[in-house]
Interface confidence: low
């Protein structure tokens, strides 16, 4: 038995940060989960996690640079990611592994979601063009 | 280096009880799930009982579920079974166990041997 997760198939970051909100067809009240977020079509970089236990605080750490962090709903782990730069412009999968109560649960590979990283460009408003040269 | 020293084994009475230490180093014990199983003389391997990070979810085999009790203090990174109404068929080497996943583990101790004998 898996877990089914759902995700937007595709999110821009204006701003250099994203909500992505991994919604799973399993209830995480009460269960100790991880839940993490990887990059690429291999899933090969693991972006964020978010560990959680009912009775502990909710954790939430990336090892590999990425500025994060992770809101919990009932059904949802909300990844929230700042900083990013535009080729880091890929998909991003959702992952949930459910190890207590068992059964050990985890989930059906997703569709993803394509994170489109819009840089900033500091140029100046063409209301504004600044002082003009004599 | 992980490492996972049971202690605690012995030879005890029917119905007599025993409790179990795993003290755990090498590793954030705080971090992982444990676990306790164990091998009967010319048996395979039973598991018994796993334990969250927390201390607060467990699980029990059917065999060991109302006399057997999983508990953990992570402040001293040591995992503990309480074993009362013991049986001649809990005769058996209890080891401690770091959990990877449900009922998987990456990481075993030496072992205790648990005697019940009259």
């Known amino acids: 038995n898996k877990i089914l997760v759902k995700q937007s198939p595709m999110l821009v970051a204006y701003d250099n940060a994203v909500n992505l909100s991994c919604k799973y067809s399993y209830n995480l009240f009460s269960r100790e989960f991880r839940a993490s977020l990887h990059k690429g079509l291999d899933s090969a970089v693991e972006v964020c996690v978010v560990y959680g236990n009912y009775s502990q605080q909710l954790q939430v750490y990336s090892k590999t640079g990425f500025n994060c962090d992770g809101k919990l709903g009932n059904e949802s782990v909300t990844f929230y990611l700042q900083n990013l730069y535009v080729n880091q412009t890929d998909i991003y999968f959702c992952k949930i592994e459910v190890m207590y109560p068992p059964p050990y649960l985890d989930n059906e590979k997703s569709n993803g979601t394509i994170i489109h990283v819009k840089g900033k460009h500091l140029c100046p408003s063409p209301l504004f063009p600044g002082p003009s040269k004599p | 280096e992980v490492q996972l020293l049971e202690s605690g084994g012995g030879l005890v009475q029917p119905g007599g009880s025993l409790r179990l230490s795993c003290a755990a180093s090498g590793f954030t014990f705080e971090n992982y799930g444990m676990a306790w199983v164990r091998q009967a003389p010319g048996k395979g391997l039973e598991w018994v009982s796993n334990?969250?990070?927390?201390?607060?979810?467990?699980y029990y085999a059917d065999s060991v579920k109302g006399r057997f009790t999983i508990s953990r203090d992570n402040s001293k990174n040591t995992l503990y079974l309480q074993m009362n109404s013991l049986r001649a068929e809990d005769t058996a080497v209890y080891y401690c166990?770091?959990?990877?996943?449900?009922?998987?583990?990456?990481?075993w101790g030496q072992g205790t041997l648990v005697t019940v004998s009259s």
């Open positions: 334990i969250g990070r927390a201390g607060s979810v467990t």
């Open positions: 166990a770091k959990v990877q996943s449900w009922r998987t583990f990456d990481y």
